[in-house]
Interface confidence: low
């Protein structure tokens, strides 16, 4: 069931209020963005649960087995043993065997390329999306999600890892980007700003949204996350922008109402299973897609990003709760946990719908500068 929490069809780029790049780092929307400092202060991205290997936190959940054999995600070296949620395990920055990405933060030292050389790669994320320059690709079919409606028990782990709030997902959540492009959901996490300062990672024509949700998936072609890192299509992230709306979003409230319990960095709690798909926009047919990277160290490339055209609506109070409840490292508030947009360096963003025609109110007439590259896969 879909809640009336979504803007019926809010095309990205349809001027909503909010500063462009509140941190003074103008996210240049041109496709020829010149490379910038890897991650200007306050504009970087986060890993996850244990500073896992990428897009925020590559999780502790494994994918469901496939017909050819049981593929599964073996926990990466950064996953820790169970602990008590009331005894915060402040290990977001501790050294872990086999984990080169333990020490990084948003803004300041060390520079991310020093943490992981891949962070200086040419095809990084997030990026600025310019609908006018997107290539309409009819081969991009509606996304398919299966098993995302979870029963209340067993409960799921919700953790403040010092970089974000992350919900670890159980086995069995299947997602298909198209025929033969099947994935298993691993975890989801959020990026946000601060009071009056939007904090989405991706931007649309330079516009930054209040917040952004990422649902991280592992391709069924790989048994483990570490195998998939850096491999084209090995990981896929579904991303949606969160905007302010008039009503409380009941799906998000199931998570936001628990944030006070995990205010301290490293703390965690359990939340009842919920309909994960209710956290996403209802329109699975209209989206942008491109190949990029994890937005946190190790910044591995080859990640397929799918950014929904429709946004998700949260109340002002909910957005405030998200940005003003959690604490990060060093007794600092966990805020502005987003990475600066990265240059496209010749990449073409594809759209599953004619975005250049009907999605940008700034266009005087239909324009389509790029052609679809995804010849039907």
């Amino acid at each position: 069931q879909r809640l009336p929490r979504m803007q019926e069809d809010s095309p990205l780029g349809g001027g909503s209020s909010g500063e462009d790049d509140p941190l003074g780092e103008e996210d240049l929307p041109s496709e020829e963005d010149s490379p910038r400092e890897e991650d200007p202060p306050g504009e970087e991205d986060l890993p996850g649960e244990e500073d896992l290997p990428g897009e925020e936190d590559l999780p502790e959940v494994k994918p469901k087995s496939e017909e050819e054999g049981s593929l599964k995600l073996e926990d990466l070296p950064t996953v820790e043993a169970p602990g008590d949620p009331q005894e915060p395990q402040n290990n977001a920055h501790r050294d872990k065997e086999g984990d080169d990405q333990s020490h990084w933060r948003y803004g300041g030292d060390p520079p991310w390329p020093r943490v992981s050389p891949a962070c200086a790669g040419r095809f990084q994320s997030p990026v600025d999306i310019r609908p006018q320059l997107a290539a309409f690709c009819p081969a991009l079919r509606p996304l398919e999600l299966l098993g995302f409606q979870l029963p209340p028990l067993p409960e799921l782990r919700l953790r403040n890892n010092g970089h974000s709030v992350q919900l670890t997902l159980p086995p069995g959540l299947e997602m298909a980007l198209g025929p033969g492009r099947e994935y298993r959901a691993l975890q989801l996490h959020l990026h946000w700003g601060a009071a009056g300062r939007p904090g989405s990672e991706h931007t649309v024509e330079g516009h930054r949204f209040p917040a952004e949700i990422h649902v991280v998936h592992l391709s069924t072609a790989f048994a483990r996350v570490d195998e998939a890192l850096g491999r084209p299509g090995g990981l896929a992230v579904l991303a949606a922008f969160l905007e302010e709306g008039p009503e409380e979003n009941s799906a998000y409230e199931q998570l936001l109402s628990r944030l006070e319990e995990i205010a301290e960095e490293g703390s965690e709690t359990q939340v009842p299973g919920l309909d994960i798909s209710a956290l996403l926009p209802s329109d699975f047919s209209r989206y942008f897609q491109y190949e990029g990277s994890l937005t946190t160290p190790p910044c591995a490339q080859g990640v397929i990003w799918t950014v929904f055209n429709q946004t998700v609506m949260l109340s002002a109070k909910q957005l405030h709760t998200l940005s003003d409840t959690l604490w990060g490292p060093g007794d600092s508030r966990l805020q502005l946990n987003f990475r600066a947009t990265q240059p496209l360096n010749g990449r073409v963003i594809e759209a599953s719908f004619p975005a250049g025609v009907d999605s940008s109110p700034r266009a005087a007439e239909p324009v389509q500068l790029n052609s679809c590259l995804a010849a039907g896969d």
Partner: antibody, heavy 115, light 106 residues
Framework: ELVESGGGLVQPGGSLRLSCAAS????????MNWVRQAPGKGLEWVSG????????YYADSVKGRFTISRDNSKNTLYLQMNSLRAEDTAVYYC??????????WGQGTLVTVSS | DIELTQPPSVSVAPGQTARISCSGD??????VHWYQQKPGQAPVLVIY???NRPSGIPERFSGSNSGNTATLTISGTQAEDEADYYC?????????FGGGTKLTVL
């Protein structure tokens, strides 16, 4: 720490209420479960309850006879057992179970159903 | 509901490797946890999420899970490892245990 109490000898058809006092972790944040073990037998999950009591689950063998509940203000988990049968004789453990297994188990309390 | 099947007993000589299996339909798509239980004591978690050791559990304990079978492996088995071992998983809100395996160290 989890400490069970309330076990004892009861006749078939009788009732018993088990309690589990929790300490050392944030009880109100956690789903809780009862697991039992008949003498010389294996572990059998009995019932589970969400952190806020909104959801309860039961094994088929006890459905309709047992009721799980909790009082977060007292950090206590309960299991009300009615219409007891001989096959309910077991050590009853309360346990905190999540996708990452049992973080904690109590030491158990013995329930004996016999005439 | 998923059913977990374990062998009733496994014997191993000290210093050798013990393997305890847990089978169930499509078990590889579920997380499996393993508990050790010694007489008169509560169960102790030794492996969680198929192959992860909680702190305090010796490195000789390891786990795997694929296809229809999960396996608990104890390398260099010691006398103190003699105990009952149970696999456990979840199936839509219900907790499921295997029947248990008695490990005898000869």
């Amino acid at each position: 720490e989890l400490v069970e109490s309330g076990g004892g000898l009861v006749q078939p058809g009788g009732s018993l209420r088990l309690s589990c006092a929790a300490s050392g972790f944030t009880f109100s944040n956690n789903a809780m479960n009862w697991v039992r073990q008949a003498p010389g037998k294996g572990l059998e999950w009995v019932s589970g309850i969400s952190y806020d009591s909104s959801k309860t689950y039961y094994a088929d063998s006890v459905k309709g006879r047992f009721t799980i509940s909790r009082d977060n203000s007292k950090n206590t988990l309960y299991l009300q057992m009615n219409s007891l049968r001989a096959e309910d004789t077991a050590v009853y453990y309360c346990a905190r179970l999540t996708y990452t297994g049992a973080y904690r188990w109590g030491q158990g309390t013995l329930v004996t159903v016999s005439s | 509901d998923i059913e977990l099947t374990q062998p009733p007993s496994v014997s191993v000589a000290p210093g050798q490797t013990a393997r305890i299996s847990c089978s169930g339909d499509n078990l590889g798509s579920y997380y499996v946890h393993w508990y050790q239980q010694k007489p008169g004591q509560a169960p102790v978690l030794v492996i969680y999420d198929d192959n992860n050791r909680p702190s305090g559990i010796p490195e000789r304990f390891s786990g795997s899970n694929s296809g229809n079978t999960a396996t608990l492996t104890i390398s260099g088995t010691q006398a103190e490892d003699e105990a009952d071992y149970y696999c456990q998983s979840y199936d839509f809100g219900k907790v499921v245990f295997g029947g248990g395996t008695k490990l005898t160290v000869l």
